[in-house]
Interface confidence: low
């Protein structure tokens, strides 16, 4: 999906008002210095591409993020403010349904959400310092 047509300011507002708080709740009890940020992005569309990938694509050791509150709100924000986004996500929804029903907060998931926090922060302050 090409995220260049999204309404970035509206998505930013959704992040600041709710998604950021849900990410903090998920990470509660974890030190902010525990994980190093290894994923970055250079522009807001690029950031949304990485955010989508980390939020909705199951990875080894963390298959359950898509059912978290921050993920559902992220999906809603993208669906509302990115034209045509919903139509591209039918396959992703099927994959989400196959994900584990129980919410298991593994260390790998915590690390992944820590990366997401960094990506969202970069979304609000785009532009890489260095390529």
């Amino acid at each position: 999906y090409d995220f260049t047509n999204c309404d970035f300011e509206k998505i930013k507002a959704a992040y600041l008002s709710t998604i950021s708080k849900d990410l903090i709740t998920y990470m509660s009890g974890t030190k902010s210095t525990e994980f190093n940020n290894t994923v970055s992005c250079s522009n807001r569309p690029h950031c949304l591409t990485e955010i989508q990938s980390l939020t909705f694509n199951p990875t080894a050791g963390c298959a359950s993020l898509a059912k978290e509150m921050f993920a559902m709100k992220t999906k809603a924000a993208l669906a509302i403010w990115c034209p045509g986004y919903s139509e591209t996500q039918i396959n992703a929804t099927q994959a989400m349904k196959k994900a584990r029903k129980s919410k298991v907060t593994t260390n790998k998931c915590l690390e992944q959400v820590s990366q997401l926090q960094g990506l969202w922060r970069r979304f609000n302050r785009p532009l890489l310092k260095q390529q």
């Epitope: 785009p126 890489l128 390529q131």
Partner: antibody, heavy 117, light 107 residues
């Protein structure tokens, strides 16, 4: 209304320094990056570097690393670009431009710097 | 560094003509390209960003498109105020680089 107002034209001798200012108004200064771009007479646009007004972190291209200093004064919403050890090839119009995603939606009017002995 | 090769360097056209300017990136920059218009003695003005998004207040006769690493700025019907120099610029990552410019002159 967003405005970037730059300081006036300068004439300098080789080896001297010049400091160009860019006063921003009409938006939150620390939200946008400030970039500096120069244009030699009859030539194209050359990106020099950028500064993040929120924390003053700068990124400069290699050729300017030793001679350019970019600073900001948050209290007056002003960005500065100082170029030292001036040479004749530094004669150019210097522009400040604000950006969020790397494209420039607002530019200063430009400051002409002439280096001549 | 990413190199931006812009062509042609100049062109002559008449009012009402369809004008096409191209820019080729030395590597994949996705849609991270902007187009500017510059008139003598003035600062550049943003026309298009993210390759195809028209900037606020820019007439609809201007349009941008992308195919791989090739980017195109099209003016569907050239107007007298469109005679100027046009620059492309990638905004994918540092260092930002501009194309060499295309001067659009009156035939």
């Amino acid at each position: 209304e967003v405005q970037l107002v730059q300081s006036g034209a300068e004439v300098k001798k080789p080896g001297a320094s010049v400091k160009v200012s860019c006063k921003a108004s009409g938006y939150t200064f620390t939200t946008y990056w400030m970039h500096w771009v120069r244009q030699a007479p009859g030539q194209g646009l050359e990106w020099m570097g950028m500064i993040d007004p929120s924390d003053s972190e700068t990124t400069l291209i290699q050729k300017f690393k030793d001679r350019v200093t970019m600073t900001v004064d948050k209290s007056t919403s002003t960005a500065y670009m100082e170029l030292s050890s001036l040479r004749s090839e530094d004669t150019a119009v210097y522009y400040c431009a604000r950006t969020l995603d790397g494209y420039y939606d607002y530019w200063g009017q430009g400051t002409t710097v002439t280096v001549s002995s | 560094d990413i190199q931006m090769t812009q062509s042609p360097s100049s062109l002559s056209a008449s009012v009402g003509d369809r004008v096409t300017i191209t820019c080729r990136a030395s590597e994949n920059i996705y849609s991270y390209l902007a187009w500017y218009q510059q008139k003598p003695g003035k600062a550049p003005k943003l026309l298009v960003y993210f390759a195809k998004t028209l900037a606020e207040g820019v007439p609809s006769r201007f349009s941008g498109s992308v195919s791989g690493t090739d980017f195109t700025l099209t003016i569907s019907s050239l107007q007298p105020e469109d005679f100027a120099t046009y620059y492309c610029q990638h905004h994918y990552g540092t260092p930002w680089t501009f194309g060499g410019g295309t001067k659009v002159e009156i035939k």
